[in-house]
């Protein structure tokens, strides 16, 4: 007979699906790393549920997560970043479900920032530049970036360009004249580390010049 038979809450809990997903962010706060997890079912009752990570840690055997609303997270310098850690959902001392995960394979980079677009009249093009905090990091330095742009009126018609640098040139003739464009960028690990796309950068908005009727070229803005 189960030692938990008297506990109605736990009996119900054992019928639930405790599947969860996580991502890591390395050197997200100085030399501190973070690990963020959430249940895949947003409706799981998380009242008494905790997350714990054990293994592939420096100086300690296990660490407990902090809870914020429906997410669980750790910020620490103690990730070894070699080998797999065991991440468990727990009620008290009882583990409900566990996953063995190598934190270097679930990396989510920080979002790029300082996105801007400059029109070059003589070259008839737009130079897109942005920044990423990963240029200064020790671990996740090499990223692939996804620049997406669209005419503002075309809700879901995004054009995507993948690049490894933080500079892109868009030819004026490939864009509609006298139109408002939205552009944004995100990043994903591209060397040794594996994982997920970052959040999108804040969008940048720019207007393309009018067409100069006499020459068929666009007027500068």
């Amino acid at each position: 007979e189960s030692g938990y038979a008297q506990n109605g809450d736990l009996e119900d809990a054992e019928l639930d699906d405790y599947s969860f997903s996580c991502y890591s962010q390395l050197e997200v706060n100085g030399s501190q790393h973070s690990l963020t997890c959430a249940f895949e079912d947003p409706d799981v009752n998380i009242t008494n549920l905790e997350f714990e990570i054990c293994g592939a840690l420096v100086e300690v055997k296990c660490l407990n997560f902090r809870k914020l609303q429906e997410i669980y997270f750790i910020e620490t310098k103690k990730f070894l970043l070699i080998g797999k850690s065991n991440i468990c959902v727990k009620v008290g001392e009882k583990s409900l479900t566990c996953k063995k995960i190598d934190l270097t394979t679930i990396v989510k980079p920080e979002a790029p920032f300082d996105l801007s677009v400059v029109y070059r009249e003589g070259a008839n093009d737009f130079v897109v530049t942005f920044n990423t905090s990963h240029l200064q990091k020790k671990y996740v330095k090499v990223l692939m970036h996804d620049v997406a742009y669209r005419q503002e009126k075309d809700e879901n018609k995004w054009t995507h360009v993948n690049l490894s640098s933080t500079k892109l040139t868009l030819l004026q003739r490939k864009l509609q004249p006298a139109a408002m464009y939205e552009i944004k960028v995100r990043s994903i690990p591209d060397h040794y580390f594996k994982g997920f796309w970052s959040e999108w950068s804040p969008s940048y908005y720019f207007r393309t010049p009018e067409i100069n009727n006499s020459s068929g070229e666009m007027d500068p803005i």
Epitope: N29, T36, A38, L68, E70, I71, E199, W200
Partner: nanobody, 121 residues
Framework: QVQLVESGGGSVQPGGSLRLSCATS????????MTWYRQGPGKTRELVAV???????TYADSVKGRFTISRDNAKNTMDLQMNGLKPEDTAVYYC???WGGGLNREPFDYWGQGTQVTVSS
């Protein structure tokens, strides 16, 4: 569909202050990034301030030291305290809440309708 509602706009003299608020009509995933944008007369929409779930903030150069963004994750709200307002701050201010996807949550990108801020003597 989640609705974002901005409030707190109005008219103020140069040097004055306003506090904008953005409230959601539904539950927003706590990891979402919250952003204020603005669009001045005859201008393109521009970033004003960003706050991540961790509370990390970023500001446009033009508002640094004058504007402060904050959020309350428990209430799914975001505020923008605007001090030392200048005529060039005149614009419609929009709040935006964005999640790029992952952790089994679908991506979303919600916008408010905007609130007018006018700075004039």
């Amino acid at each position: 569909q989640v609705q974002l509602v901005e409030s707190g706009g109005g008219s103020v003299q140069p040097g004055g202050s306003l506090r904008l608020s953005c409230a959601t009509s539904g539950s927003i995933f706590s990891l979402a990034t919250m952003t204020w944008y603005r669009q001045g007369p005859g201008k393109t929409r521009e970033l004003v301030a960003v706050i991540t779930w961790r509370g990390t903030t970023t500001y446009a150069d033009s508002v640094k030291g004058r504007f402060t963004i904050s959020r309350d994750n428990a209430k799914n709200t975001m505020d923008l305290q605007m001090n030392g307002l200048k005529p060039e701050d005149t614009a419609v201010y929009y709040c935006n809440v964005k999640w790029g996807g992952g952790l089994n949550r679908e991506p979303f990108d919600y916008w408010g309708q905007g609130t007018q801020v006018t700075v004039s003597s």
